[in-house]
Interface confidence: medium
């Protein structure tokens, strides 16, 4: 039978009355238009809602927006449009919410054509009050907060100027002209590219990469012949044009651009691209596009320096620059990533890695599902997950896969069961062990969200008709209860819950449509009375992550250590609570060859854990620039996987000896860098 329809599904007692007492409707006095919602701070309960409506007139478009504020997680809203002088807010800039719990908000206003600059509204008290500030420039991008100091803002102007504020947008200073792209680094550092001749587009590949560590008092040119740059974890990447032709290569720095090394990755041509898929302080996943319009490329994983790369996955689906990839970090379990590959027959298949890109496999077929029409063998197939690509292709997939760091092991996604992703209507599947095993959770497409660190999962059917029913589960999606939250169905547009999945409130957004009017409406449901008591020690059970063979002493070892978690029992109906912290007990594993990647010039033959020298490099000196120094490298072929904590066991030793050889492979050598002050 379908999930949730079994006899053993116990009902949550008196839930209708409990939820009815905790369901709060708010009808917005608005024409429909568009709505955007932002949470201000963590655990503050403050939500800002901006509704905008465009009235197309013959000559111009007249716009009107309203701003609403809630401080009780969306149960009640107050119209605060007067705090921003009833000004029309530009939705393309969104609401710029400050980092952490700074309580800062910046809204960018629409201004009339002749004005000399833009206008912003600033709040530093969680949107209780706003200050209007006229800008000396027209912003091109949303204001960007420094991650270290929320008083420091940067923005690009429509004239390509780089503007900085040191007092939360009160006063602005243009620190550089002809800027293409600017990003905050660590320690209030700003990295940006500049053009010398015509424009960003015309100078692509001839840009300069600059750095300022003092908000524009002094500058250092840290790169030339730049195509683009990116930051990931502790790595700074630049794609640099080769001297001889139109190809470019990735260079990497771990010291804010003072010194660079060429990444051992293939170069790419004009039509190709590099993309940082994921990065942390240990390593990076890099996608390198294939030549031609293939729609796929190769994933490489880096060593701890970001220099040496191992091929991780072939035929990785990534349509075009800035296009679609299904690459997803499963945040509920360490080391797990899901993505799609384009197979030889042009079908799309899902792959998963449990060891940070070391090995990829298909997802195991859910026990309670049959193989669909794409399967050649009806008994052998796997689960294929719908993500960004399916959504872009307009499949009936309302949401991307969902996981939360504090809902350990839980992954929810739309999928189909067969040999490849199917164009058929998908179902919703859940994994409670980080992607090792899967179960069909809900039939047909749904919106879903995780509340109370996994204690509650909420879902709403994706339907063509107005809806008035919400589904919820207190046992990680095994059994479902349905609750009619309103007598009058609404056209559903989205589910909103506080980021971080710690809340017990869910807001259902939609609009009502009658013959003449159409209004935004939200229903906020608080599940606190469903989970009547706080969870106690007896409600939790010990779970070993990545366990595949309990008989094996090394069971659960991933990247050199295993972790035991305390997890809520499925049968326990209780509150983890807002202060819930994931309890985990790590233990170090013995090293094996699996804990090492092959160094540059070495590779692993299939089904072998030993690294062997690449034939074409046998007997050659390996040469590349390490930290900008001239270095000759001899190696026995192994390097510990970034983030791997194993000790003892197998331990191949690595030698590096310095030979004064000319380093020829670094376009960003120190002599091409210079400094100057404002």
């Amino acid at each position: 039978s379908a999930p949730g329809e079994d006899e053993e599904c116990g009902r949550v007692r008196d839930f209708v009355a409990k939820l009815a007492n905790n369901t709060h409707q708010h009808v917005f006095d608005d024409l429909r238009g568009s709505v955007s919602l932002s949470w201000v701070g963590d655990s503050t309960g403050v939500i800002l809602v901006l509704t905008t409506f465009h009235v197309p007139l013959v000559i111009m478009t007249f716009g009107q927006s309203k701003l609403y504020r809630s401080e009780d997680y969306g149960k009640n809203f107050k119209d605060i449009t007067d705090l921003i002088n009833n000004t029309f807010i530009r939705t393309e800039f969104g609401m710029a919410i400050g980092p952490e719990n700074s309580g800062k908000v910046v809204l960018t206003a629409e201004v009339s054509g002749g004005s000399r600059g833009g206008r912003i509204f600033r709040s530093s008290d969680f949107a209780k009050n706003f200050v209007q500030t006229d800008l000396p420039f027209h912003p091109l991008t949303q204001m960007m907060y420094s991650p270290q100091n929320s008083d420091y803002l940067l923005a690009l102007s429509t004239e390509n100027g780089l503007w900085v504020s040191k007092n939360f947008g009160g006063k602005w200073e243009e620190i550089h002209k002809a800027v293409c792209l600017a990003k905050w680094g660590s320690d209030n550092t700003i990295f940006f590219t500049t053009y010398a001749n015509g424009s960003c587009k015309a100078d692509l590949g001839a840009l300069e990469l600059w750095r300022t560590s003092d908000l524009g008092k002094s500058f250092k040119t840290i790169g030339v012949k730049i195509y683009s740059f990116g930051l990931g974890g502790r790595f700074l990447f630049a794609s640099v044009m080769a001297d001889k032709d139109t190809t470019r290569r990735i260079h990497v720095s771990t010291d804010q651009g003072d010194t660079w090394s060429m990444a051992q990755l293939p170069s790419v041509g004009q039509e190709q691209f590099y993309s940082i898929l994921a990065a942390n302080d240990d390593m990076v996943f890099m996608h390198v596009d294939e030549p031609g319009d293939t729609g796929f490329g190769t994933i490489f994983t880096s060593d701890d320096r970001g220099i040496v790369y191992s091929k991780s996955l072939d035929r990785h689906l990534y349509t075009t620059t800035g296009g679609e990839t299904d690459f997803t970090n499963v945040t509920s379990l360490r080391g797990v990533y899901i993505t799609s590959v384009l197979s030889e027959d042009n079908s799309i298949q899902t792959m998963i890695t449990f060891d940070q890109g070391g090995r990829w496999t298909h997802l195991r077929k859910p026990e309670n599902s049959e193989c669909d029409a794409t399967a050649k063998n009806k008994n052998e197939c796997s689960l294929h997950i719908h993500a960004s690509y399916s959504i872009s292709q307009k499949l009936n997939v309302p949401m991307a896969p969902l996981s939360e760091p504090n809902a350990v092991g839980i992954v929810i996604a739309h999928g189909s069961v067969g040999d490849a992703i199917s164009v058929m209507v998908p179902d919703v599947y859940i994994s409670d062990d980080g992607g090792y095993s899967w179960t069909k959770m809900l039939e047909g497409p749904h919106y879903y969200t995780i509340l109370d660190s996994g204690g509650i999962i909420v879902a709403i059917e994706h339907s063509s008709r107005p809806i008035n029913v919400i589904k919820f589960s207190t046992d990680e999606g095994q059994c479902w209860q349905t609750y009619t939250f309103t007598r009058d169905p609404i056209y559903f547009t989205g589910l909103a819950s506080e980021p971080g999945a710690r809340s017990m409130n869910i807001s259902i957004w939609g609009f009502t449509e009658s013959f003449l009017t159409s209004q935004w409406v939200s229903y906020t449901i608080d599940f606190k009375d469903i989970l009547e008591r706080n969870c106690e020690e007896k409600d939790y059970t010990i779970w070993l992550a990545h366990s595949t063979d309990p008989e094996d002493y090394e069971d659960g070892c991933i990247l050199g250590y295993k972790e035991q978690f305390l997890r809520l029992r499925k049968s326990s109906v209780c509150q983890n609570g807002r202060d819930y912290v994931v309890t985990k007990q790590p233990s170090i594993c013995l090293c094996s060859l699996e804990d090492f990647l092959c160094d540059f010039g070495y590779y692993r033959p299939e089904n072998d854990s030993k690294c062997v020298e690449q034939p074409e490099l046998k007997g050659h000196d390996l040469e590349f620039c390490l930290y900008g120094r001239e270095e000759h490298l001899t190696t026995n072929g192994y390097r510990k996987i970034p983030g791997d904590k194993c000790q003892g066991g197998v331990n191949p030793v690595r030698e590096v000896k310095d030979l004064k050889k000319k380093c020829t492979s670094n376009f960003l050598s120190p002599e091409k860098q210079n400094s100057k002050s404002n």
């Epitope: 042009n346 997939v397 994706h462």
Partner: antibody, heavy 129, light 107 residues
Framework: QVQLVQSGAEVKKPGASVKVSCKAS????????MSWVRQAPGQGLEWMGI????????SYAQKFQGRVTMTRDTSTSTVYMELSSLRSEDTAVYYC??????????????????????WGQGTTVTVSS | EIVMTQSPATLSVSPGERATLSCRAS??????LAWYQQKPGQAPRLLIY???TRATGIPARFSGSGSGTEFTLTISSLQSEDFAVYYC?????????FGGGTKVEIK
């Protein structure tokens, strides 16, 4: 107006292949899937498979797997269905049908399964020695 | 695959009378169900989608109901042009499947 125009009738020998075309007009070709359905004389409707015009990905009914190939040409807004290793029981009228299927088009009223809303006039394929 | 069973195979009704056609799915198809009308020598025509929504231009005398495994097509007052074969079709799981059809003939 929205229409699907199919190629003309075909007579084939057993073992041969047939390729039927279906030209779409009056709507954005890449916004809808195309299904192929056949109907043997005096029989009911039988779904053969579906193609996504954007990426060209397909899903075929198990019965036709290995024998059917669906392709599309976005430049001419045409979908093709090729059936190989023909046998006498493949004698039927073959229809192409616009099939929103899994596509969620913009706007709340057009979500969910919408049925095969536009059909071609049908192509009669006769397989006989 | 999901098997769709239609009943009755033939339905004899007088013009002006009500006709009720049934369609049963071997497993739940939610509301992913469509009804088609086909007249001799013509391509099928979409009547109902999403189990109960009338397609564009379909008269109000046609209505669909049901969800899960049991579905009904009702023609409230048969007109002469309604005598035809009616098919149900599910789009819940691949492959799409049709029922065997119900022929509505003049009594």
């Amino acid at each position: 107006q929205v229409q699907l125009v199919q190629s003309g009738a075909e007579v084939k020998k057993p073992g041969a292949s047939v390729k039927v075309s279906c030209k779409a007009s009056g709507y954005t070709f890449t916004k809808y899937y195309m299904s192929w359905v056949r109907q043997a004389p005096g029989q009911g409707l039988e779904w053969m498979g579906i193609i996504n015009p954007i990426g060209g990905s397909t899903s075929y009914a198990q019965k036709f797997q290995g024998r059917v190939t669906m392709t599309r040409d976005t430049s001419t807004s045409t979908v093709y269905m090729e059936l190989s290793s023909l046998r006498s029981e493949d004698t039927a009228v073959y229809y192409c049908a616009r099939d929103p299927s899994g596509i969620a088009l913009a706007g709340p009223a057009s979500r969910g399964y919408q049925g095969m809303d536009v059909w071609g006039q049908g192509t009669t394929v006769t397989v006989s020695s | 695959e999901i098997v769709m069973t239609q009943s009755p195979a033939t339905l004899s009704v007088s013009p002006g009378e009500r006709a009720t056609l049934s369609c049963r799915a071997s497993q739940s198809v939610s509301s992913n169900l469509a009804w088609y009308q086909q007249k001799p020598g013509q391509a099928p025509r979409l009547l109902i989608y999403g189990a109960s929504t009338r397609a564009t231009g379909i008269p109000a005398r046609f209505s669909g109901s049901g969800s899960g495994t049991e579905f009904t097509l009702t023609i409230s007052s048969l007109q002469s042009e309604d005598f035809a074969v009616y098919y149900c079709q599910q789009a819940r799981l691949g492959p799409w499947t049709f029922g065997g059809g119900t022929k509505v003939e003049i009594k």
